[in-house]
Interface confidence: low
């Protein structure tokens, strides 16, 4: 449906508040280093222009595409060359190449200062003084640090952020009210960002077909009572929404997401019985709720899969006629019967089925050839089941911190070339799978664990892509989206790695460690652990445990000392010497 003015169309659909918020997010995700005030100025200019187009769609420039309008605006930034270097070359290009160029320069790990949370009273004063600026600043700071954050969902986070301040800044104990809410938003926000990053990587690196396959499997698990045609329609619409958001088309994305939520709620009878509560909520909450809704109950009378996909004489005929539709139906039928499987496992099974049909439908006796295809699924199903069982046992034995340390050692030995901060961040997140998923009953463990691991390993992949240092990481990240986790699991110690030279400075600590939060202190210790493994990749678990126990005792002792700095200096030297001896460094 063509509109004379796209910008007027989106302004009218979204309303001024959401329009301004989404343009701010889009600009901050593109120009991640620009000061807040510069972005606000650009957004206000775009908004004023949009209003002139709403008044008269035939006005000058109102017929231009959003990419043209936004790109032209971004290219007016005076310090583009100094701040962004070669990204300024994007401005010499025409659309759509210019937008593609901006997208390629999005930085998953921008060199920005860590966000420090001010005192509660300071935050509440800022909130009351200028609520609008305070909330815009939140959008800006999150968007620039997470350039692929799902924009319509960020609006939902901002709404909750505002609600937290509105409630807590008038509470008797502001801090007790506010801080847990902010912690929850921070943790949920990081998880949401990482999940969306995987969706964008899936679309951008592996294509629409890969994303659609993921969506068919996930939606079929969630809506097992829905017809295949219904699931296919939802998949098509969902793919459009995520393609737009991942492509920087945030206004279109938010608009289409709202339409999809509306469609789902209008047709919930033919989709799922679990949608009723979600559909009574306002738009942002509704969309979020639908995205997180629990799986509907499976229909009671589902026939065996073998009849249509193995025993039927028409398997090869149906496959040849429309390969993707037939494979889509296989995936739909398998997924709706298996909410206990991870999406990536379901996709591995579908891939195995596809490979078998490709081979067998060209054979002399196709049926004979593919008759045992379901037997090939057994090892694929057992591999993640066994892995999760072993790792949950280890987690229950060690607790989260020590489980993270075990993974730190494991992954540093696999890919020691990866930077220490990345190894710490990724291994800490991998370790969180324990508290997140091991508490679940068997039927929910695999979808929780393996699909979460896919999200975390994608973080490793996108961070590594920025500065590639390991062929093994590149191989596991690029060969197959659904086999990333098995690929990393299969890696052994990298025998080609030349150990890092010992540097005492890396293991020198100061009294400032005593004032850190427990989490920050853990990160310091885990950073030291990674460095130890990089120096001594052949160190045994027992050796590493002994050194880490000594290190923990050293920190505890010096933090209790009267003259902390002297203690850290003197005892630190002894610790380094003892560690070198223990590890043979």
């Amino acid at each position: 449906d063509a509109h004379k003015s796209e910008v007027a169309h989106r302004f009218k659909d979204l309303g001024e508040e959401n329009f301004k918020a989404l343009v701010l997010i889009a600009f901050a995700q593109y120009l991640q280093q620009c000061p807040f005030e510069d972005h606000v100025k650009l957004v206000n200019e775009v908004t004023e222009f949009a209003k002139t187009c709403v008044a008269d769609e035939s006005a000058e420039n109102c017929d231009k595409s959003l990419h043209t309008l936004f790109g032209d605006k971004l290219c007016t930034v005076a310090t583009l060359r100094e701040t962004y270097g070669e990204m300024a070359d994007c401005c010499a290009k025409q659309e759509p190449e210019r937008n593609e160029c901006f997208l390629q320069h999005k930085d998953d790990n921008p060199n920005l200062p860590r966000l420090v949370r001010p005192e509660v009273d300071v935050m509440c004063t800022a909130f009351h003084d200028n609520e609008e600026t305070f909330l815009k600043k939140y959008l800006y700071e999150i968007a620039r640090r997470h350039p692929y954050f799902y924009a319509p969902e960020l609006l939902f986070f901002a709404k909750r952020y505002k609600a937290a301040f509105t409630e807590c800044c008038q509470a008797a104990d502001k801090a007790a009210c506010l801080l847990p809410k902010l912690d929850e938003l921070r943790d949920e926000g990081k998880a949401s960002s990482a999940k969306q990053r995987l969706k964008c990587a899936s679309l951008q690196k592996f294509g629409e077909r890969a994303f659609k396959a993921w969506a068919v499997a996930r939606l079929s698990q969630r809506f097992p009572k829905a017809e295949f045609a219904e699931v296919s329609k939802l998949v098509t619409d969902l793919t459009k929404v995520h393609t737009e958001c991942c492509h920087g088309d945030l206004l279109e994305c938010a608009d289409d997401r709202a339409d999809l939520a509306k469609y789902i709620c209008e047709n919930q009878d033919s989709i799922s019985s679990k949608l009723k509560e979600c559909c009574e909520k306002p738009l942002l909450e509704k969309s979020h709720c639908i995205a997180e809704v629990e799986n509907d109950e499976m229909p009671a009378d589902l026939p065996s899969l073998a009849a249509d996909f193995v025993e039927s004489k028409d398997v090869c005929k149906n496959y040849a006629e429309a390969k993707d539709v037939f494979l889509g139906m296989f995936l739909y039928e398998y997924a709706r019967r298996h909410p206990d499987y991870s999406v990536v496992l379901l996709l591995r099974l579908a891939k195995t089925y596809e490979t078998t049909l490709e081979k067998c439908c060209a054979a002399a006796d196709p049926h004979e050839c593919y008759a045992k295809v379901f037997d090939e699924f057994k090892p694929l199903v057992e591999e993640p089941q066994n892995l999760i069982k072993q790792n949950c046992e280890l987690f229950e034995q060690l607790g989260e911190y020590k489980f993270q340390n075990a993974l730190l050692v494991r992954y540093t030995k696999k890919v020691p070339q990866v930077s220490t901060p990345t190894l710490v961040e990724v291994s800490r997140n991998l370790g969180k799978v324990g508290s997140k998923c091991c508490k679940h009953p068997e039927a929910k463990r695999m979808p929780c664990a393996e699909d979460y691991l896919s999200v975390v390993l994608n973080q490793l992949c996108v961070l590594h892509e920025k500065t590639p240092v390991s062929d093994r990481v590149t191989k596991c990240c690029t060969e197959s989206l659904v086999n990333r986790r098995p690929c990393f699991s299969a890696l052994e110690v990298d025998e080609t790695y030349v150990p890092k030279e010992f540097n005492a400075e890396t293991f020198t600590f100061h009294a400032d460690i005593c004032t850190l939060s427990e989490k920050e202190r853990q990160i310091k210790k885990q950073t030291a652990l990674v460095e130890l493994v990089k120096h001594k990749p052949k160190a045994t678990k027992e050796q590493l445990k002994a050194v880490m126990d000594d290190f923990a005792a050293f920190v505890e002792k010096c933090c209790k000392a009267d003259d902390k700095e002297t203690c850290f200096a003197e005892e630190g030297k002894k610790l380094v010497a003892a560690s070198q001896a223990a590890l043979g460094l």
């Epitope: 219904e230 047709n267 006629e321």
Partner: nanobody, 114 residues
Amino acid sequence: QVQLQESGGGLVQPGGSLRLTCTASGFAFSNFGMSWVRQPPGKGLEWVSAISADSSTKNYADSVKGRFTISRDNTKKMLYLEMNSLKPEDTAVYHCVIGRGSASSQGTQVTVSS
């Protein structure tokens, strides 16, 4: 079970007309945009025309614009393609599909030849 059954194809002379019909069953037809796609001999699938669920939007490939008209009747669960001024290059198997998906139906053969 989703089923799409095309009919109305046949042999016609250049300049002639045909009306294709697609009968749908097994899904909520009135909720879905529908398309016609075709597969000329020895070639891949090509999109011909699409219509939104409520018939408010209709789109056509440049090669058929002004000659073909897409329409639907939601009460009867039927999709139509009116084809006028047919040319030899319109020869193909025509399929109706949900949205702009791949063809999973048998299709109906249209041959334009003198």
